[in-house]
């Protein structure tokens, strides 16, 4: 019995659902009563899911698997694995027995995008050309381990004094911290590029340093020029700093964070103590760093609704303020592709290809391309619907007349994360069925 599975690993984002495709060709008169279908982990032989004696025996794998029961009779033995975890990565074997027996193994490659790196500079005051500084680039909750590249403002690699560490958390996701020690020139941009090798997703952060003395007078409050990009569900640091004068004590400090537009209070430090969060109890200051001029705000479990501008007010004797923008983002899932009609296709047939990608933010850009990368702009309809958390589900439909053969690719781009998720359908010149059986 010939059992077909994809040659390439199935790539699934942590937290999304994955389909491990497996198919066989049922003979005429085949009934499900004849079928024994077993999915198991290839290495350990642990049972994952089974269908025997004419019925679904259910999931033996943390109750997170399901078969496509309505498609089983047509030879679709695929397995749906829900809420993918890092620990799921590996090889799954699909055993099919009717009268004959066949099996094949499919690999699951788990991935998670890295957050936009946050950049910190030490020391960060009174910098002069010739000073040695430490620039730290931190990017969170990605998988698998990242590749980290440092570049100057012209793109030249900075390979000198770089130390990169990657630590896995309890879910197996990696936090990356890369430290560059560099001697300052007259001015310079230092960029850190964190690459997810599986998703081919690059997240980058930059810091531009113009060494000079700060002007005296009003309190100079520094915030990042670029928006702080935070993934939904992660924590974000809204950086804000000031330069305390000699003899400064926290008793002199009034620090207020508020929403720029509505002036809603977010967090405050006055009268020498932390007055706490006024923003759903999800904010915190870095109290141990406040005396050194670090007025940054930590915003926990970021939501879409948090997007916008936050103002950092600092008053000692003088007064200063600056606003920092928070840009919320969520990666789109790998698109699922459906084809209608999906049987006995011939050149000249008109088909509808649907590309669906879920739970991203902000709204996606959708591109359709043929196998050579040429855009397919003809008959395309794209809709994007926000769920109750404000995350978008994208559905894009392409109507196309089949040629002798062709690949139709849908690319769903997150414009903020610069993350592309794509799915493809390849249709050959022979009469065929989708998903392909070979």
């Amino acid at each position: 019995l010939e059992v077909q599975v994809p040659e390439d690993p199935v790539v699934a984002l942590v937290g999304t659902d994955a389909t491990l495709r497996c198919s066989f060709s049922p003979e005429p008169g085949f009934s499900l009563a004849q079928l024994n279908l077993i999915w198991q982990l290839t290495d350990t032989k642990q049972l994952v899911h089974s269908f025997t004696e004419g019925r679904d025996q259910g999931s033996a794998y943390a109750n997170r698997t399901a078969l496509f029961l309505d498609l089983l009779a047509q030879g679709n033995a695929s397995l749906r694995l829900q809420r993918v975890r890092v620990a799921d990565e590996g090889s799954f074997t699909c055993f099919v027995s009717i009268r004959d027996f066949g099996s094949a193994a499919v690999s699951l490659q788990v991935a998670a995008p890295y957050s936009k790196p946050s950049m910190t500079l030490e020391p960060n005051k009174d910098l002069r050309p010739g000073d040695t500084v430490t620039i730290t680039c931190s990017s969170y909750r990605g998988y698998p381990e990242a590749e980290v590249f440092w570049q100057d403002g012209q793109g030249a690699p900075l390979t000198g004094n770089v130390t990169t560490s990657q630590m896995a958390n309890e879910q197996g996701l990696f936090d990356v911290h890369s430290v560059l020690r560099v001697v300052l020139g007259a001015n310079g941009t230092y960029s850190c590029l964190v690459r997810n090798p599986v998703l081919q997703q690059d997240a980058h952060g930059s810091i531009t340093i113009t060494p000079q003395r700060s002007p005296t007078g009003a309190v100079e409050v520094q915030v990042p020029e670029d928006p702080v990009v935070a993934l939904v569900g992660t924590d974000a640091t809204l950086r804000c700093s000031f330069s305390p004068e000699p003899g400064f004590s926290l008793a002199q400090l009034n620090l207020i964070w508020q929403l720029t537009d509505t002036k809603q209070l977010v967090h405050s430090f006055t009268e020498g103590r932390d007055q706490g969060s006024a923003y759903a109890n999800r904010t915190a200051l870095f109290l141990d760093l406040l005396a050194q001029g670090n007025a940054s705000l930590r915003l926990q479990r970021v939501r879409v609704a948090d997007e916008g501008s936050f103002t950092c007010f600092v008053s000692i004797r003088d007064f200063g303020s600056a606003a920092v923008s928070l840009q919320v983002a969520a990666p789109y899932s790998k698109p699922s592709m459906t084809l209608e009609p999906n049987k006995d296709l011939r050149p000249g047939d008109t088909v509808t290809i649907t590309c669906s990608s879920y739970r991203g933010y902000p709204e996606a850009e959708v591109f359709w391309q043929d196998g050579q990368g040429a855009p397919l702009t003809g008959n395309v309809t794209t809709s994007q619907m926000a769920n109750e958390q404000g995350l978008f589900d994208v559905h894009s439909v392409l109507r196309v007349v089949l040629g002798a053969n062709g690949t139709y690719s849908c690319l769903v781009r997150n414009p903020v994360l610069q993350q592309d998720a794509h799915g493809s359908v390849t249709i050959t010149g022979q009469p065929m069925t989708f998903p392909p059986e070979a």
């Epitope: 590749e147 590249f149 570049q151 100057d152 403002g153 012209q154 793109g155 030249a156 690699p157 390979t159 020139g185 001015n187 310079g188 941009t189 960029s191 850190c192 590029l193 690459r195 081919q200 690059d202 980058h204 930059s206 531009t208 113009t210």
Partner: antibody, heavy 120, light 106 residues
């Protein structure tokens, strides 16, 4: 449409200097570094250096450090390269090429090239 | 500096033939780019980040490799593929190119 339009061919005498330009359009000039590449008659490509129009930072191939000076004019979205103390070895086609920073995407767009001929 | 050695220097292929050219680095590099140049025109980015095919490049082109050994492959040669192909690295300074592989139509 992204375009990198280079200045015309130059015939210069040995020992002289020449300044060639690369006028850009179709994108935000300050968001990309501009690099320069030499292609001599043997078809060998050599990287000269690059400049970040945003802050004016430059990175040079040490081989060309005393030969080339890179500048930008943000107001006209134009990058320029001056070559000095020219010899016959400097006769070549010089290309400007756009580079997204930071990235590992290589030179995504190239100018059409400027032929510099050094001859007495 | 990292020296990139391309081989062969010149090769020819018939239409439909599979073509592979290589680029060997004197030290390990993180990624490789490939450019196509036809006579009298500027180089064009063809493959970047080792294996990513640039926009508009036919799907018959692919790139692979790691460390010191990289290659560009054409699954089925076509007349329009006749050109010179250059590899390029910038994992360490200075940025360097290979001397090129000239691909001719047989």
């Amino acid at each position: 449409e992204v375009q990198l339009q280079q200045s015309g061919p130059e015939l210069v005498k040995p020992g002289a200097s020449v300044k060639i330009s690369c006028k850009t359009s179709g994108y935000t000039f300050t968001e990309y570094a501009m690099h320069w590449v030499k292609q001599s008659h043997g078809k060998i490509l050599e990287w000269i250096g690059g400049i970040n129009p945003n802050i004016g930072g430059t990175t040079y191939n040490q081989k060309f450090k005393d030969k080339a000076t890179l500048t930008v004019d943000k107001s006209s979205s134009t990058a320029s390269m001056e070559l000095r103390s020219l010899t016959s070895e400097d006769s070549a086609v010089y290309y400007c090429a756009r580079f997204l920073v930071p990235s590992t995407e290589g030179f995504t767009y190239w100018g059409q090239g400027t032929l510099v001929t050094v001859s007495a | 500096q990292i020296v990139l050695t391309q081989s062969p220097a010149i090769m020819s292929a018939s239409p439909g033939e599979k073509v592979t050219m290589t680029c060997s680095a004197s030290s390990s590099v993180s990624y490789m780019h490939w450019y196509q140049q036809k006579s009298g025109t500027s180089p064009k980015r063809w493959i970047y980040d080792t294996s990513r095919v640039a926009s508009g490049v036919p799907a018959r082109f692919s790139g692979s490799g790691s460390g010191t050994s990289y290659s560009l492959t054409i699954s089925s040669m076509e007349a329009e593929d006749a050109a010179t192909y250059y590899c390029q690295q910038w994992s360490s300074n200075p940025l360097t190119f290979g001397a090129g592989t000239k691909l001719e139509l047989k």
